[in-house]
Interface confidence: medium
Amino acid sequence: KLTIESTPFNVAEGKEVLLLVHNLPQHLFGYSWYKGERVDGNRQIIGYVIGTQQATPGPAYSGREIIYPNASLLIQNIIQNDTGFYTLHVIKSDLVNEEATGQFRVYPELPKPSISSNNSKPVEDKDAVAFTCEPETQDATYLWWVNNQSLPVSPRLQLSNGNRTLTLFNVTRNDTASYKCETQNPVSARRSDSVILNVLYGPDAPTISPLNTSYRSGENLNLSCHAASNPPAQYSWFVNGTFQQSTQELFIPNITVNNSGSYTCQAHNSDTGLNRTTVTTITVYAEPPKPFITSNNSNPVEDEDAVALTCEPEIQNTTYLWWVNNQSLPVSPRLQLSNDNRTLTLLSVTRNDVGPYECGIQNELSVDHSDPVILNVLYGPDDPTISPSYTYYRPGVNLSLSCHAASNPPAQYSWLIDGNIQQHTQELFISNITEKNSGLYTCQANNSASGHSRTTVKTITVSAELPKPSISSNNSKPVEDKDAVAFTCEPEAQNTTYLWWVNGQSLPVSPRLQLSNGNRTLTLFNVTRNDARAYVCGIQNSVSANRSDPVTLDVLYGPDTPIISPPDSSYLSGANLNLSCHSASNPSPQYSWRINGIPQQHTQVLFIAKITPNNNGTYACFVSNLATGRNNSIVKSITVSA
């Protein structure tokens, strides 16, 4: 059947439309297009004769129409008047006629809308505001947006005038937002610029800060007032009813008891004409003396001395308080308070007891703090550490060793090589070392105040060729699915590459395997029984390579769910019952049996001769692995028939 398709159906003014013909019959003589729903010579647009390929304009031809050999009609530069129906009249070679009608609609391209308002400064809880979307356009849909969201559902929001007008009744400060309107028709959509609604409100009841109402003589009084208000409020201060000043802040330096009284803040909004006030009562107290701490030992020795700290001055009927590291006193058997809390004794001080310590005297208003006191605890030296941790160096490099021991006062250091004193410095430096510099390097740390000294010895080997490495492990018996194991390739040597093999193969790619510390450390996370393999590390440098002996990881696992064999569950009376229990476990588990819940023997095999129906019941095998701390069990029902 002959049909007409309009592309597009909705056409914007000034654009073009194609009336596309479908199912055009064969053997045509020609065709004509007409404006309207029927063939009317007065409304012919154009005719076309196929034989001559001649197009002939009709009375309704506007010069904007183009006819194609396939009978489709293109209309350009569309105007509003073009809206409507178009009829195609087809004349076949046998002079039989056929007709089809199509249609399209024309819409204007919408202009960018704007918003007009009937009230630019509405007052909260009093005014209404009506926004209107301009211009008024026929066949247009109007939409509204608040803060780029569609309109919320609210009884205070009302759309009217075909949605062209948005009214906000009884505006609130929360209506201060960005408003946009949008016009839409089938061919265009345009959004307006934002209009910000400026709602006048307040002032709310002012708040005075800080909330503190008690002050000490000699302090500064600094009160600040704030009230939510649009436009911002103007502030006034009154003390005991007497006007002081028109500022947001009230500042009185070095107050005395005479400054006690009622302080009023008044907030005024000139646009809404409203006033609000808030009153606070300020009390000023006389100044007590500032406390201080005395100590019976200014340089106590760690693990030897006790220290008594006393809070001065002594005042009758006063509460004394103490703080360590800005915290209240921790519970500790080494901390003792006297009956009146004025003296704090530290028994057997440690280096962690340095403080700072503060004491306080409590009065009706506040707590007066002393200045902090820090204890100078003498300690150490601890065992010195020599860095770097390398034990192998290649010839020709510089050897630079540094020694450090925790100590107060700081330790004095001495270096010995193979027992011979070298120098009294914290660092030892030897340039361009050779094999002859191999030996025992001792660092001695001495604390002149405590008189204590400690030493650490490190073996240094100077060789271009690396030694046979060994593997150290942080966990010799890890538990499956629980523990991690870190293997470290020893020794630590400069300019050295570290390599690893598992069962003679290079490391597999696995998220549970991680190399760190310059590949010197291999960590296996969440070990499994399959990780019980031979691990080898290798070291190499410019002239040598060497491999460690294998280390086999002993992974503790299980017990898994046991299996009872044989699987038979039905027996004849008089037969022997011989049940064996097995569970995968490392180390081997301990086995025990229960029959109908009653404990039997602690063996892997349960044997009962010449069973009878009395032996019917549930047979449970229990397994436990003392190393992993895990247990497991299985239950089997046995039926004995007579």
């Epitope: 290649r394 271009a464 060729e465 030694p467 410019s542 002239v543 040598s544 390579a545």
Partner: antibody
Framework: QVKLEQSGAGVVKPGASVKLSCKAS????????MHWLRQGPGQRLEWIGW????????EYAPKFQGKATFTTDTSANTAYLGLSSLRPEDTAVYYC?????????????WGQGTLVTVSS | QNVLTQSPSSMSVSVGDRVTIACSAS?????MHWLQQKPGKSPKLLIY???NLASGVPSRFSGSGSGTDYSLTISSVQPEDAATYYC?????????FGGGTKLEIK
Amino acid sequence: QVKLEQSGAGVVKPGASVKLSCKASGFNIKDSYMHWLRQGPGQRLEWIGWIDPENGDTEYAPKFQGKATFTTDTSANTAYLGLSSLRPEDTAVYYCNEGTPTGPYYFDYWGQGTLVTVSS
Amino acid sequence: QNVLTQSPSSMSVSVGDRVTIACSASSSVPYMHWLQQKPGKSPKLLIYLTSNLASGVPSRFSGSGSGTDYSLTISSVQPEDAATYYCQQRSSYPLTFGGGTKLEIK
């Protein structure tokens, strides 16, 4: 297959300089150290030193300090030995040697050698 | 530098003989390595880290020793073993070689 191909033999005059090449195939020289050695007529092997092609670090035997210079062109996978101020006693076969273990075992690959003859 | 002295400097043996070559170091070393060089050829690694056979080396070759004294042994000499054998130390710079032991087969 690992192979080290050295440049051909040459005759040079005393006081002259020469640059020998060693082209590697079957491995990337950046993963190795390249050693250079020489062997005079009827003499023992002498180690000249090594270069790390990855960063250009070098180690020279004291005897060859100032005489030998190691360089590499990693894009050409080639190592070079420069010899300066040549004297008749520098007449020798010069070898390049990939002397670094790349696994748990030693792998020692040698070039075929280049004969340098110093003669007027 | 660490001087390596090999003995003997040359020897002539029959097929099937057991041969031992000694290498003495002027300073103690943790390991010794052995190379084999046939006339007109490049050296080839024979034994590394004192006693480990390099890839493809027959088991009749073995190495031992410690400190300053090391040795290479061929348990049953074969005609293809005719070559010069060098010991090498890699413990101190410069790396050094022995003077070589030339092995001839009668």
